[in-house]
């Protein structure tokens, strides 16, 4: 988790002088509780936005927006703590809005936004806005939290972000898989414009099972420049196992920008349709 590299983060607006500060996620009001504390944020909304860094890179960001309740507690509102928690790693990043002037009621509801938390593709977050000072122990909570899901790199807008492009999101291998005679599969895919090797991972399964019955790995050497964007054709030999008929072909590239961690593409071949008429049952049963 990090903040987008903007020169100065701004939270001031007409009628309010405000500054954005880094925060340890442990506001002073936790340690020194105040008697009078503001009410919680209203209508917290988190949206996926996209922003450029000063270097021109495009990143997904969490756009956080909320409003204030129209009660007298805004007279005691000194700021807000914004927290983004990555759910699995428990990594947390916070910033603090510090109000340098007192809020007053005006004809419009006060609205705040912040769009500088960089988020990762395919990750899950909890976003919390805490009004400051935080409540006394056992006081009514004055925060609001929302869960937030960032799409993966297959999402149209995500695909062109810097982290997705670095993991190979622009490569579309257009995989085709064809079943041949003699227990073989022909795999065809489009090479990318980089002289890097690929790996084909074949996993086969029985018709309705999820436990594999055959696995095979095939290495494809780095193509020459004249082969970039051309189709690569590979024939894989299958294990002759009855019922081991559903095949998943996964292609793993090793681009220089993502090495072992590039996006993989896969295609699946289903088992052939079962005939409607059942097989005749033999009039004797083997004993083995």
């Amino acid at each position: 988790l990090r903040l987008l590299d903007h020169r100065a983060l701004v939270c001031s607006q007409p009628g309010l002088n405000c500054t954005v500060k880094n925060s340890t996620c442990l506001d002073d009001s936790w340690i020194h509780p105040r008697n009078l504390t503001p009410s919680s944020p209203k209508d917290l909304q988190i949206q996926l936005h996209f922003a450029h860094t000063q270097q021109g890179d495009l990143f997904p960001v969490a756009h956080i927006e909320w409003t204030l309740q129209t009660d007298a507690s805004i007279l005691y509102l000194e700021g807000a703590e914004l927290s983004v928690l990555q759910l699995n790693t428990n990594e947390r990043l916070c910033v603090r809005f510090e109000f340098l002037s007192k809020l007053r009621h005006h004809h419009r509801r006060w609205r705040f936004t912040f769009s500088h938390f960089v988020v990762d593709p395919d990750q899950e977050y909890e976003v919390t806005v805490h009004h400051l000072p935080k409540p006394i122990p056992d006081g009514d909570p004055n925060h609001q939290s929302k869960n937030f899901l960032v799409p993966d790199c297959e999402h149209a807008r995500m695909k062109v972000t810097t982290p997705c492009m670095s993991s190979g999101s622009l490569w579309d291998p257009n995989i085709t898989v064809e079943t041949l005679e003699a227990h073989q599969l022909r795999v065809s895919f489009t090479l990318w414009n980089e002289s890097t090797h690929y790996q084909i991972l074949l996993t086969s399964f029985p018709h309705m099972e999820n436990h594999s019955c055959f696995e095979h790995m095939h290495h494809i050497p780095a193509p020459r420049p004249e082969e970039f964007h051309q189709r690569s054709n590979v024939t894989l030999t299958l294990r002759n196992l009855k019922g081991c008929c559903r095949h998943q072909v996964q292609i793993q590239p090793f681009f220089s920008s993502c090495l072992n961690d590039c996006l993989r593409h896969s295609a699946t071949v289903s088992c052939p349709e079962m005939p409607d008429t059942p097989e005749p049952i033999p009039d004797y049963m083997p004993l083995w």
Epitope: Q45, Q47, T89, N90
Partner: antibody, heavy 116, light 107 residues
């Protein structure tokens, strides 16, 4: 190929405990949390909570607080869900699933029957 | 807790039909909604996440739309393997909650 394989069916008496395991393969274990969802016979899905495979942090549904414990073993890429003080209405299929908010891969389910 | 209500409770359709299933949240979940398919005796399978994003490997005949409180799952041309129960699930607010499910049956 991402796979979550759960332990086998269990029959328990009321008041007993059950511990269901969920072994993952095909991905980096600490990259995604594990959620637990249950489904009573003929009923819908009920979220029980989740555990961070990275930090061990847990988040339980209020209904199960005090009765459920979720743990993980990083060395074997296995998650566990223990439910105590079982009652007959805990009879259900218990599923583990990868991730926290969108449950993209699921175990095959473990049927827990609570009967005297 | 947020209540998720699906309608209709069940529906009958034929192969090739366009099928629409709706899900309503008791309060806004913005786009924090997933759709799952479950066949008898099997675990649920994720179809759509974040209201409209197609999960990898799911056929493109499935699509999702909506935001706020009203959401729709559409199957553009029903296939034999699509006869199943469909659940919506909101994830914006804790605890995560599921709809009661809608069974799509063969007419």
């Amino acid at each position: 190929q991402v796979q979550l394989v759960q332990s086998g069916a269990e029959v328990k008496k009321p008041g007993a405990s059950v511990k269901v395991s969920c072994k993952a393969s095909g991905y980096t274990w600490t990259s995604y949390g594990i959620s637990w969802v249950r489904q009573a016979p003929g009923q819908g899905l009920e979220w029980m909570g989740w555990i961070s495979t990275y930090s061990g942090n847990t988040n339980y549904a209020k209904k199960f607080l005090g009765r459920v414990t979720m743990t993980t073993d990083t060395s074997t890429s296995t998650a566990y869900m223990e439910l105590r003080s079982l009652r007959s209405d805990d009879t259900a299929v218990y599923y583990c699933a990868r991730r926290v908010l969108r449950l993209d891969y699921w175990g095959q389910g473990t049927l827990v029957t609570v009967s005297s | 807790d947020i209540q998720m209500t699906q309608s209709p409770s069940s529906l009958s359709a034929s192969v090739g039909d366009r099928v629409t299933i709706t899900c309503r949240a008791s309060q806004s979940v913005h786009t924090g909604l997933n759709w799952y398919q479950q066949k008898p005796g099997k675990a649920p399978k994720l179809l759509i996440y974040g209201a409209s994003n197609l999960q990898s490997g799911v056929p493109s005949r499935f699509s999702g739309s909506g935001s706020g409180t009203d959401f729709t799952l559409t199957i553009s041309s029903l296939q034999p393997e699509d006869f199943a129960t469909y659940y919506c699930q909101q994830f914006e607010h804790n605890p995560l909650t599921f709809g009661q499910g809608i069974k799509v049956e063969i007419k």
